[in-house]
């Protein structure tokens, strides 16, 4: 089966790598623009130069292209706790990240929020905090894991999942209650 190609891909595949087919004359292959530049004018004829211009401040192209406009630089999202790791250049978009001792949580493919790594108080670090994953904690006896924090078993309600982990404590509480009623 031949994979379905879009119009641009079909046009590009007629020309050798690094070239694209002239939009008005499909017998002409023009050289693509280098990263950091964009297409100002198509080449006038075979073997003639494509008119490429450098991206203006605040815009970029990260690969060879025949785009009519450069792409706008991304901005790091302060409300999501993001910080700028490296600023935008004509051939590379802004790189955003998190501060030290924070990790990225991706709400969607292109949206992340920075959160503090868990410290595993009342527990031990099972897996260290990583760029895209919070610390994994193991709780000490008498504590259970809730939303990645070790919480005292005294806060465990019978209906919750913690009952298995806090079973001895719950039995003790139950025993105390029972002894108090006789």
């Amino acid at each position: 089966l031949v994979p379905h190609l879009g119009d641009r891909e079909k046009r590009d595949s007629v020309c050798p790598q690094g070239k694209y087919i002239h939009p008005q004359n499909n017998s002409i292959c023009c050289t693509k623009c280098h990263k950091g530049t964009y297409l100002y004018n198509d080449c006038p004829g075979p073997g003639q130069d494509t008119d490429c211009r450098e991206c203006e401040s605040g815009s970029f192209t990260a690969s060879e292209n025949h785009l009519r406009h450069c792409l706008s630089c991304s901005k790091c999202r302060k409300e999501m706790g993001q910080v700028e790791i490296s600023s935008c250049t004509v051939d590379r978009d802004t790189v955003c990240g998190c501060r030290k001792n924070q990790y990225r949580h991706y709400w969607s493919e292109n949206l992340f929020q920075c959160f503090n790594c868990s410290l595993c108080l009342n527990g031990t670090v099972h897996l260290s905090c990583q760029e895209k994953q919070n610390t994994v904690c193991t709780c000490h006896a008498g504590f259970f894991l809730r939303e990645n924090e070790c919480v005292s078993c005294s806060n465990c309600k019978k209906s919750l999942e913690c009952t298995k982990l806090c079973l001895p404590q719950i039995e003790n509480v139950k025993g105390t209650e029972d002894s108090g009623t006789t």
Epitope: R77, K78, E79, M80, H105, W107, Q113, F115, N116, N134, E147, N148
Partner: nanobody, 119 residues
């Protein structure tokens, strides 16, 4: 007690418009970035849009970009989502929430408002 009350949902034809509102109480609304998320039938939560405290910085999911507008009125403690050019795939229950602070979970929810896009 924190309360978030969504309204404005309903049945609308493809291409139509709706304006959702979220009335907030029990916290200092002007101090909190706010979020709209949605849940389509049988699917997980999808982040739709968010807005910073003062209404200056906004974000839109690719699926709604150019069609939805998020805004807020801090004097009325209300968050809005204006939806244009609605499509069948926008059918979902829409929820407003405070942007999480401590971890990737929403502490407070409204009951949601159902948007159905159908001819």
């Amino acid at each position: 007690e924190v309360q978030l009350l969504e309204s404005g949902g309903g049945l609308v034809q493809p291409g139509g418009s709706l304006r959702l509102s979220c009335a907030a109480s029990g916290f200092t609304f002007a101090h909190e970035p706010m979020v709209w998320v949605r849940q389509a039938p049988g699917k997980g939560l999808e982040w739709v849009s968010h807005i910073d405290r003062v209404g200056q910085d906004t974000y839109y999911a690719d699926s709604v970009k150019g069609r939805f507008i998020i805004s807020r009125d801090n004097s009325k403690n209300t968050l809005y989502l204006q939806m244009y050019s609605l499509r069948a795939e926008d059918t979902a229950v829409y929820y407003c929430a405070m942007l999480p602070k401590r971890g990737p979970r929403f502490g407070y929810w409204g009951q949601g408002t159902l948007v159905t896009v159908s001819s």
